[in-house]
């Protein structure tokens, strides 16, 4: 059995109330295991977007190597985040708004060389990190898809897919597809090329749209396409609205595999106040699908806190020296260095959640059931067969609340126990590992809880 621990019990007469009972072999045999679903690598954990390689390097001493080579020096860090794939770039040559001077087969020398890229691919492979290349053509320009020359661009993309697949990339991303005429048919064609090369390759499409109908129409003709959008950023950050968005999406897409993020490219801090970052990390890592983050999400990187930094791509804060532009602007607790050394930091939470997400069957591919709870709360269960089960309770509100979990909403296969062990809280102060009575559960403002409980036959 995959990971299942069937405890074998010796049955005594006492257990049987003193009576002699005949117990058939069938009664003693462990229940049959549910067949495991086929899982691709992008099902097994988070994706990490590095849209701007230069910003990711940091300023100062971090900026010693060309960005692609510099990224190679950060792979151990990415391994420590337990992310499964790296969404990189765009890094191709693109003269703003000039189709003729846009070459999807050539790396812009500002980022490094093809040799650097090949070396990055090799190093990433050794560390089991997949590399997805963003091929959004006119990334420096106004319209990402040169709206007037769609066919020329589409041909360039086709050639690029074939070229980079041969070079060894694990997938592709194209963004701003709301600006691409006939997006559905182009995506279908690009998906065919990608999957034709290998079923193990991934195509990600990104849109700024938050409209469910538009999203569904893109997904309709594209099985296995992973789509990032602004769908969840419309939640107004309330529990009820978030719950309805999530459940609506899952129902509308027929529970097909999806991705979870707040946008196709931007940082979580663009949409969320600091006090909700932990809550959203917990949610994104525990919903059924692939969580997708942008570099810096793990430390709460916030462009607004860094004078002169662009909102869409602020400098990554490795340590206090990463932003020498304004002395004193960066404190230790804003950096990877400072947060790595603090078990209570956002980064430490990210690492723990990512670890759970990549190893627990119920989180890897378990069923999902949302159910009613107190106002402002969003709660759900993740479970798979006889594996450990998870209960997530999220308080989006500004006030402490009784959880008020309505277990009657749940199917028999996903019933709640009286108590569950606290795996983690997004807030300090709770004793991890302690059993909590679910009927008496109270949450602090903006608190999220991840609880675990065993399967019970």
């Amino acid at each position: 059995h995959h990971h299942h621990h069937h405890e074998q019990k010796l049955i005594s007469e006492e257990d049987l109330g003193g009576e002699q009972k005949l117990i058939s072999e069938e009664d003693l045999r462990a229940p049959r295991c549910r067949e495991l679903p086929a899982q691709k690598w992008w099902h097994t954990g988070a994706l990490y977007r590095i849209g701007d390689l230069q910003a990711f390097q940091g300023h100062g001493a971090g900026n010693l190597a060309a960005p692609i080579s510099g990224l190679k020096g950060r792979l151990d860090y990415l391994s420590s985040l337990k992310v499964k794939g790296l969404v990189l770039g765009p890094i191709h040559k693109n003269q703003k708004d000039d189709v003729a001077q846009t070459d999807l087969l050539q790396i812009d020398p500002n980022f490094g060389s093809k040799e650097d890229f090949d070396s990055l691919l090799q190093s990433a492979k050794k560390k089991s990190i997949r590399v997805i290349l963003d091929l959004t053509p006119n990334y420096r320009g106004e319209n990402s898809w040169f709206s007037t020359q769609v066919d020329t661009v589409a041909t360039k993309v086709k050639d690029a897919l074939e070229f980079w697949l041969q070079a060894g990339v694990d997938g592709f991303q194209v963004r701003d597809i709301e600006n691409l005429k006939d997006a559905s048919s182009f995506l279908a064609e690009w998906q065919n090329i990608t999957k034709g090369f290998s079923e193990d390759r991934l195509l990600i499409a990104g849109t700024n749209s938050s409209d469910l109908q538009q999203i569904l129409s893109l997904l309709e003709s594209n099985k296995d396409l992973l789509l990032t959008s602004s769908y969840l950023s419309d939640s107004g950050s309330t529990g009820e609205h978030t719950k309805s968005l999530v459940t609506q999406y899952l129902n509308a897409t027929g529970n097909r595999w999806c991705s979870w993020s707040l946008s196709q490219a931007r940082l979580l801090t663009s949409f969320l106040p600091a006090q909700l970052l932990r809550l959203y990390q917990l949610m994104l890592f525990t919903l059924p699908g692939t969580p997708v983050f942008s570099y810096g999400d793990e430390i709460g990187l916030d462009a607004a806190a860094l004078p002169g930094q662009p909102m869409e791509a602020p400098v990554m804060l490795w340590d206090e020296s990463s932003f020498p532009d304004i002395p004193g602007a960066v404190s230790a607790n804003m950096t990877v260095k400072g947060q790595s050394e603090d078990p209570g930091s956002l980064l430490s939470l990210f690492r723990r959640l990512s670890d759970q997400r990549s190893k627990e069957r119920s989180l890897l591919h378990g069923d999902f059931h949302a159910f009613s709870a107190g106002p402002g709360l969003f709660s759900y269960i993740r479970h798979w067969d006889q594996n450990e089960r998870f209960l997530v309770v999220l308080n989006f509100g500004d006030v402490g609340l009784s959880a008020g979990l309505q277990a009657s909403d749940l199917p028999a296969s996903a019933s709640l126990p009286a108590k569950a062990d606290l795996l983690l809280s997004t807030q300090p102060g709770r004793e991890e590992g302690s059993p909590l009575e679910l009927e008496r559960l109270k949450l602090e403002p903006h608190e999220g809880l991840l609880l675990r409980f065993p399967y019970a036959a």
Epitope: G62, N63, L64, A65, A66, S69, R74, D76, W318
Partner: antibody, heavy 123, light 108 residues
Framework: QVQLVESGGGVVQPGRSLRLSCAAS????????MHWVRQAPGKGLEWVAL????????YYTDSVKGRFTISRDNSKNTLYLQMNSLRAEDTAVYFC????????????????WGLGTTVTVSS | DIQMTQSPSSLSASVGDRVTITCRAS??????LNWYQQKPGKAPKFLIY???SLQSGVPSRFSGSGSGTDFTLTISSLQPEDFATYYC??????????FGQGTRLEIK
């Protein structure tokens, strides 16, 4: 194969100047930050200076600031160290090396050293 | 600046011995520590990065451990070619990069 070869060392009087060169081959020189490290006779290793891949960032150990200048010519795959106002305590074997970036959580697998060139400052 | 202190400064050992060299940083450097081996008249050779990761091509008898301020380099069974000087080096944050003063390992 990956190689760094230093040249330009020699015997020089205190107060005079010397320019060291380091020729790189076997890797994309223009993609890596480069360092100079020295070793005085019978002593340990001392980091001297570093330069970023494109020459835009330069750093020096305190004892050489204002006297030494690190530079590079990526078209020639060559690293330089211009040493002015030399002192007796600058006497050492000078190595050029690619060591990676001294920032948190950065680990370079591109760690290459030359064989060194000897600088002797003596009157 | 971060100071690196190695101990012992020198030690004598025999082929087949297990040898441990320690390195202490004046402040926490997480795991940003490298180890080098240098033979007389030669350039230093990179052995271990990130405190415990073996550089490719380095024999598995070499191992590194530690985090924060205290680190060790262990050679599980000394070979004749291992007699050399060993240096630790921190690359934790912002120049300067600093090396330990070295540990000379000689044949007993």
């Amino acid at each position: 194969q990956v190689q760094l070869v230093e040249s330009g060392g020699g015997v020089v009087q205190p107060g005079r100047s010397l320019r060291l060169s380091c020729a790189a081959s076997g890797f994309t020189f223009s993609s890596y930050g480069m360092h100079w490290v020295r070793q005085a006779p019978g002593k340990g290793l001392e980091w001297v200076a570093l330069i970023s891949y494109d020459g835009s960032n330069k750093y020096y150990t305190d004892s050489v600031k204002g006297r030494f200048t690190i530079s590079r010519d990526n078209s020639k795959n060559t690293l330089y160290l211009q040493m002015n106002s030399l002192r007796a305590e600058d006497t050492a074997v000078y190595f050029c090396a690619s060591l990676g970036a001294p920032t948190y959580s950065y680990f370079s697998d591109m760690d290459v050293w030359g064989l060194g060139t000897t600088v002797t400052v003596s009157s | 600046d971060i100071q690196m202190t190695q101990s012992p400064s020198s030690l004598s050992a025999s082929v087949g011995d297990r040898v441990t060299i320690t390195c202490r940083a004046s402040q926490s450097i997480s795991s940003s520590l490298n180890w080098y081996q240098q033979k007389p008249g030669k350039a230093p050779k990179f052995l271990i990065y990130a405190a415990s990761s073996l550089q490719s091509g380095v024999p598995s008898r070499f191992s590194g451990s530690g985090s924060g301020t205290d680190f060790t380099l262990t050679i599980s069974s000394l070979q004749p070619e291992d007699f050399a000087t060993y240096y630790c080096q921190q690359s934790y944050s912002t120049p300067p990069i600093t090396f330990g003063q070295g540990t000379r390992l000689e044949i007993k």
